[in-house]
Interface confidence: low
């Protein structure tokens, strides 16, 4: 049996994945639990097995189809349930009517690369992954650069208020190792949140030329 409060949070990646986390205060004894997605206007439904991510929370990904297929639209509503098996029955532990385009979290940007690097600046580009064509250009980005001797949390955030898949980092120190990350967010959706940060891209600025004033 399960007692205590329950929190059930899901996000849609805008294409073919709904990721869910279920948190439950109280003991859950060796019970098989799943998330079940039941769209209001689609013929398919989908399930995923909740796997523990901490002592009181479980997560899973509902794979709705091929990664770049558009499985849901702005008018869809998907009933999402946490179901746990009790003997031969499934007990509903949590339920929500999920509006996918109000609860967006895109995949982290990919394919980060250094386009051009100099002593004091570096031009970096990236690509968005599995993002719906519905957004057109209505995306924004945040970027951060890790400098030597600092942490990611200390890095100032650079905001790009448009769909711009490149950045030119200025005022860098010559011959210095840096790391760079970027994340993306659609402008649409009341509960939409930032994507995870991209994998860090390591780069090194060029050394200053000898005998020249830098």
């Amino acid at each position: 049996a399960v007692n205590g409060t329950s929190q059930f949070t899901c996000f849609y990646n805008s294409r073919a994945n709904i990721s869910c986390v279920w948190s439950q205060d109280g003991a859950l004894q060796d019970t098989s639990c799943q998330v079940h997605a039941w769209p209001d206007r689609r013929r398919w439904n989908q399930t995923c097995e909740l796997l523990p991510v901490s002592q009181a929370s479980w997560a899973c990904n509902l794979i709705l189809g091929a990664p770049d297929s558009q499985k849901l639209t702005t008018v869809d509503i998907v009933t999402l349930r946490v179901l746990c098996r009790e003997g031969v029955r499934w007990r509903v532990m949590a339920i929500q009517d999920f509006k996918p385009f109000e609860n967006l979290r895109l995949m982290a940007p990919i394919s980060l690369q250094v386009v051009h690097v100099e002593t004091h600046r570096c031009n970096i580009s990236w690509e968005i992954s599995q993002a719906s064509h519905y957004f057109e250009r209505h995306l924004e980005f945040e970027a951060r650069t890790l400098s030597p001797g600092h942490t990611w949390e200390e890095a100032p955030l650079l905001t790009l208020k448009q769909k711009q898949e490149w950045i030119c980092l200025e005022t860098l120190t010559p011959d210095t190792q840096y790391e760079f990350q970027v994340r993306v967010k659609p402008l649409q959706g009341e509960f939409t949140t930032w994507s995870p940060w991209s994998q860090p891209l390591a780069f090194r600025t060029k050394p200053a030329a000898l005998g020249k004033d830098t």
Partner: nanobody
């Protein structure tokens, strides 16, 4: 093995109402998620509505939302389908279905079925 017996069908004019009942015997009723399906002449059997074992959660096909209400009385081993504002396109044989697996209830496979009751809506 579980047995299902439907009743309450009949002939009704468009805009009228009917209440279908399905009595379940042969097993513990609360083990089952219950559903109603329908099959019009020359068409495939289609999902209409479902109610979970507890009765707290219901599902409907879009075409009947706001007009049909599915419910159950676990003390009487009975599931109901209240059909209001009936339309000629609601004409079909209505079947009661039971499944212990919540996930499978919308599917026509692996359900236990009743024999069906005819609903005819005249214009």
């Amino acid at each position: 093995e579980v047995q299902l017996v439907e009743s309450g069908g009949g002939l009704v004019q468009a805009g009228g109402s009917l209440r279908l009942s399905c009595v379940v015997s042969g097993d513990v009723f609360v083990r089952y998620t219950m559903a109603w399906f329908r099959q019009a002449p020359g068409k495939e059997r289609e999902f209409v509505a479902a109610v979970t074992d507890s009765g707290r959660t219901t599902e409907y096909v879009d075409s009947v939302k706001g007009r049909f209400t599915v419910s159950r009385d676990n003390a009487k081993n009975t599931v109901y389908l209240q059909m209001n504002n009936l339309k000629p396109e609601d004409t079909a044989v209505y079947y009661c279905a039971a499944n212990t697996d919540y996930f499978q209830i919308r599917s026509v496979d692996n359900n236990a079925w009743g024999q069906g009751t005819q609903v005819t809506v005249s214009s």
